[in-house]
């Protein structure tokens, strides 16, 4: 079995303010079991954007239904984009752990740029 890879196919995405951003992410394996999280930025100060396992993320919807069997698509949509949302977004696979899940592998990142609404 080949080791799981996290694929973020878009290096950059440009979205107009007020629109919805789609950030694409797929994984290449069902192994290891564990959730996906999305972050803006890297390192200890990164901001959690979406956690498949738990939390409330009212601006985020998933593109695919993650409960469906063998799902490997963990793309998300972020609604009502503002300039403050600009940054690099990372799709990160976690491995089931006890008591806490453990970070396993990150995608290469997608840079979100926001185009101002024409006045």
């Amino acid at each position: 079995e080949e080791e799981l890879q996290v694929i973020q196919p878009d290096k950059s995405v440009l979205v107009a303010a007020g629109e919805t951003a789609t950030l694409r992410c797929t994984v290449t394996s069902l192994i290891p079991v564990g959730p996906i999280q999305w972050f803006r930025g890297a390192g200890p100060g990164r901001e959690l954007i979406y956690n498949q396992k738990e939390g409330h993320f009212p601006r985020v919807t998933t593109v695919s239904d993650s409960t469906k069997r063998n799902n490997m698509d963990f793309s998300i949509r972020i609604g009502n984009i503002t300039p403050a949302d600009a940054g690099t977004y990372y799709c990160v696979k976690f491995r089931k752990g006890s008591p806490d899940d453990v970070e396993f592998k990150s995608g290469a990142g997608t840079e979100l740029s926001v185009r101002a609404k024409p006045s």
Partner: antibody, heavy 119, light 110 residues
Framework: QVQLVQSGAEVKKPGASVKVSCKAS????????INWVRQAPGQGLEWIAM????????HYNQIFKDRATLTTDTSTSTAYMELRSLRSDDTAVYYC????????????WGRGTLVTVSS | DIVLTQSPDSLAVSLGERATINCRAS??????????IFWYQQKPGQPPKLLIY???NLDSGVPDRFSGSGSGTDFTLTISSLQAEDVAVYYC????????FGQGTKLEIK
């Protein structure tokens, strides 16, 4: 961490119905399947059915299709299994279990609810 | 429905020795490169505990003396060096289609 807390033991007469509850915490209830499994005294494990709380999609073991009904209450993160037309051979411990990988497996289990059917 | 048959029904092994439990499916449980077999351990008075998923992957926190192997229809759970705390009933389960369990194998110390 993930916890599944089941309702207490029940004693029922033949022909009656029972409804067992399973309250989930430590994760987003709508993101993972819930399975129900039973175990008669001194016997093996028998899969009953499963439910996706996000859309109430269900799959049943044919043996239980006419007598069991799975439901969920997403407002309280609780899953329910109702079994009707009880017989003495339905006496068993009934478990709920959460599928963390959408593999139709059982990663986290409740402690079980003993249902005794006796006249 | 796919039927899983475990062998043996019961097994007695000396401490420190290897224990092997087999699970045979009535038809292949493989799909898209994965083997949809899971192994559980159940101790008296407790719910089952997942040990192995997709035939050969150790679940979180499971000691590495446990291993799983096999493909298609024939699968094996191996405990490389039996410890006293491994006394339990072991079940295989498939999810190639709707889940079913094997009948269980009771593991005791010789």
């Amino acid at each position: 961490q993930v916890q599944l807390v089941q309702s207490g033991a029940e004693v029922k007469k033949p022909g009656a119905s029972v409804k067992v509850s399973c309250k989930a915490s430590g994760y987003t209830f709508t993101n993972y399947w819930i399975n129900w499994v039973r175990q008669a005294p001194g016997q093996g494990l028998e899969w009953i059915a499963m439910i996706d709380p996000s859309d109430s999609e269900t799959h049943y073991n044919q043996i239980f299709k006419d007598r069991a009904t799975l439901t969920t209450d997403t407002s309280t993160s609780t899953a329910y299994m109702e079994l009707r037309s009880l017989r003495s051979d339905d006496t068993a411990v009934y478990y709920c279990a959460m599928d963390y990988g959408s593999l139709y497996a059982m990663d986290y289990w409740g402690r079980g609810t003993l249902v005794t059917v006796s006249s | 429905d796919i039927v899983l048959t475990q062998s043996p029904d019961s097994l007695a092994v000396s401490l420190g020795e290897r224990a092997t439990i087999n699970c045979r499916a009535s038809k292949s449980v493989s799909s898209s490169g994965y083997n949809y077999i899971f192994w559980y351990q159940q101790k008296p008075g407790q719910p089952p505990k997942l040990l192995i998923y997709l035939a050969s992957n150790l679940d979180s926190g499971v000691p590495d003396r446990f291993s799983g192997s096999g493909s298609g229809t024939d699968f094996t759970l191996t405990i490389s060096s039996l410890q006293a705390e491994d006394v339990a009933v072991y079940y295989c389960q498939h999810s190639r289609d709707l889940p079913t369990f094997g009948q269980g194998t009771k593991l005791e110390i010789k």
